[in-house]
Interface confidence: medium
């Protein structure tokens, strides 16, 4: 007996061939001997089966001795043995219909779990293997689960169902809802305007939800809500904003915040959360602000940074075009009695300069100028 695998909602064509290359009488029946369809001369006749409105043949092939049964919009319960009766002989075809669905929405938050459920006919024992967009393979039986979805899991999942050495392939599009970056860091000199951007890693027709930026300043004992906002059809509207600092927010995506001035008291780290309508859980992005200040007080030239710096970052003070006078893995460095000239304060990571502030030291009879 021939086995044909089908996909729920798809179309299948079961073949039946007579030895005579001409239109002769044929009938398709199911395993209960209920007639599905057949012919009467050049007419297509249908029986009382439950397939009635979904079954068809290809009359253009009858005069070639081919009498296919086409079943549209397949259902799991269409799985059966189908019998073609032609020329006093019977051809049997076993049809097995499978369905594969994501048990929840196909739009999932980063960190959530994806469960794929296989619908299969009774008596079948299929195996399933799925390949994620990043090439990870998972295997299972009736259900497959992937916990802790990551951004790279967004895309088309290809699942192969194997039964009787035959296979059928399903493709499921999964969208992982997340920010493009889990964390970002902004380095600014004191007084500069600060731009925070929170680009999303997905696009959807309509995006509605609400969000909030909580900020933990390095100098503060507790965190504080800096801004709350609503998102309606990709339009951003601010609900509440603190007076200090007075943040500004862009009205369109990507989410964009502007801090008018980088000040030492603002240095620290924030957590932007976004709750999307009809989704349990929230999207998170961490953002860090590092602020640098270079000052000269009497005979002391000082450079300081505030905010979350890693221990491997180097802070240096050097006279322009000269070797560094002082270079330390600390958050403050200074030079006593600095020579006159343009001094540079540099925050660097493995030789790469992250932040630079220049200060002009005048001869001792003048006052210092900060460009």
């Amino acid at each position: 007996k021939k086995v044909v695998l089908g996909k729920k909602g798809d179309t299948v064509e079961l073949t039946c061939t007579a030895s005579q290359k001409k239109s002769i009488q044929f009938h398709w029946k199911n395993s209960n001997q209920i007639k599905i369809l057949g012919n009467q001369g050049s007419f297509l006749t249908k029986g009382p089966s439950k397939l009635n409105d979904r079954a068809d043949s290809r009359r253009s092939l009858w005069d070639q001795g081919n009498f296919p049964l086409i079943i549209k919009n397949l259902k799991i319960e269409d799985s059966d043995t189908y019998i073609c009766e032609v020329e006093d002989q019977k051809e049997e075809v076993q049809l097995l219909v499978f369905g594969l669905t994501a048990n929840s929405d196909t739009h999932l938050l980063q960190g959530q779990s994806l469960t794929l459920t296989l619908e299969s006919p009774p008596g079948s024992s299929p195996s399933v293997q799925c390949r994620s967009p990043r090439g990870k393979n998972i295997q299972g039986g009736k259900t497959l689960s992937v916990s802790q979805l990551e951004l790279q899991d967004s895309g088309t999942w290809t699942c192969t169902v194997l039964q009787n050495q035959k296979k059928v392939e399903f493709k499921i599009d999964i969208v992982v809802l997340a920010f493009q970056k889990a964390s970002s860091i902004v380095y600014k000199k004191e007084g500069e305007q600060v731009e925070f951007s929170f680009p999303l890693a997905f696009t959807v027709e309509k995006l509605t939800g609400s969000g909030e930026l909580w900020w933990q300043a390095e100098r503060a004992s507790s965190s504080k809500s800096w801004i709350t906002f609503d998102l309606k059809n990709k339009e951003v509207s601010v609900k509440r904003v603190t007076q200090d600092p007075k943040l500004q927010m862009g009205k369109k995506l990507p989410l964009h915040l502007t801090l008018p001035q980088a000040l030492p008291q603002y240095a620290g780290s924030g957590n932007l959360t976004l709750a999307l309508e009809a989704k349990t859980g929230k999207l998170h992005q961490e953002v860090n602000l590092v602020v640098m200040r270079a000052t000269q007080l009497q005979k002391n030239l000082t450079c300081e940074v505030w905010g979350p710096t890693s221990p491997k970052l180097m802070l240096s003070l050097k006279l322009e075009n000269k070797e560094a006078k002082v270079s330390k893995r600390e958050k403050a460095v200074w030079v006593l009695n600095p020579e006159a000239g343009m001094w540079q304060c540099l925050l660097s990571d493995s030789g790469q300069v992250l932040l630079e502030s220049n200060i002009k030291v005048l001869p001792t009879w003048s006052t210092p100028v900060q460009p």
Epitope: G6, R58, R59, P68, I70
Partner: antibody, heavy 117, light 113 residues
Framework: QVQLVQSGAEVKKPGSSVKVSCKAS????????ISWVRQAPGQGLEWMGI????????TYAHKFQGRVTITADESTSTAYMELSSLRSEDTAVYYC??????????WGQGTLVTVSS | DIVMTQSPDSLAVSLGERATINCKSS????????????LAWYQQKPGQPPKLLIY???TRESGVPDRFSGSGSGTDFTLTISSLQAEDVAVYYC?????????FGPGTKVDIK
């Protein structure tokens, strides 16, 4: 979602054969019939034949009977059309198409076969 | 073989105007058992494969704009473009799938006036 991708253009000598492939992706290849249709330069469409991969059942237009062979390889989701005893009037774009009860809802991009001495 | 003929060979219509293409089969393609006409319409643009527009004489393929409609029964069929757009410039073919071999009409070229 289903796509049919055909092999590249061919230049053949009269009397030789050509074999064009048509690879399906994104659907259940075996469950649909594949028809082959050709189109001579500046001309209309001409149906050549059909195969149902799951049963290997084929039907050919009388005009091509004996000269055309349509086959399918389920393992690679690929259908093939081989035309032998080529003559200059076989110069055409050859298309494979998914055949849904006689009409063609998805087409390959076409393969130009040029027969020239 | 069932022979398909189309008229006119070509037509030029102003943008936004109606375009009508006729197709005639040498024998009826209507099945009395399911009351379906085994006729399809295709659109073909230069350098592209044909695209299915209509099947069963009047059923629009999904994704096809509703300005395209098919009508007729038995041996006489019509494809109508209710309001011609620039992107509708193409050759249109009818095809019968009632009998083997499947056959196409010679095509009708539609241009903008």
């Amino acid at each position: 979602q289903v796509q049919l991708v055909q092999s590249g253009a061919e230049v053949k000598k009269p009397g030789s054969s050509v074999k064009v492939s048509c690879k399906a992706s994104g659907g259940t290849f075996s469950n649909y019939a594949i028809s082959w249709v050709r189109q001579a330069p500046g001309q209309g469409l001409e149906w050549m034949g059909i195969i149902t991969p799951s049963g290997g059942s084929t039907t050919y237009a009388h005009k091509f009977q004996g000269r055309v062979t349509i086959t399918a390889d389920e393992s690679t989701s690929t259908a093939y059309m081989e035309l032998s005893s080529l003559r200059s009037e076989d110069t055409a774009v050859y298309y494979c198409a998914r055949d849904t009860a006689g009409h063609f809802d998805i087409w390959g991009q076409g393969t130009l076969v040029t027969v020239s001495s | 073989d069932i022979v398909m003929t189309q008229s006119p060979d070509s037509l030029a219509v102003s943008l936004g105007e109606r375009a009508t293409i006729n197709c005639k089969s040498s024998q009826s393609v209507l099945s009395s058992s399911n009351n379906k006409n085994y006729l399809a319409w295709y659109q073909q643009k230069p350098g592209q494969p044909p695209k299915l527009l209509i099947y069963w004489a009047s059923t629009r393929e999904s994704g096809v704009p509703d300005r395209f409609s098919g009508s007729g029964s038995g041996t006489d069929f019509t494809l109508t473009i209710s309001s011609l757009q620039a992107e509708d410039v193409a050759v249109y073919y009818c095809q019968q799938y009632y009998g083997s071999p499947l056959t196409f009409g010679p095509g009708t070229k539609v241009d903008i006036k």
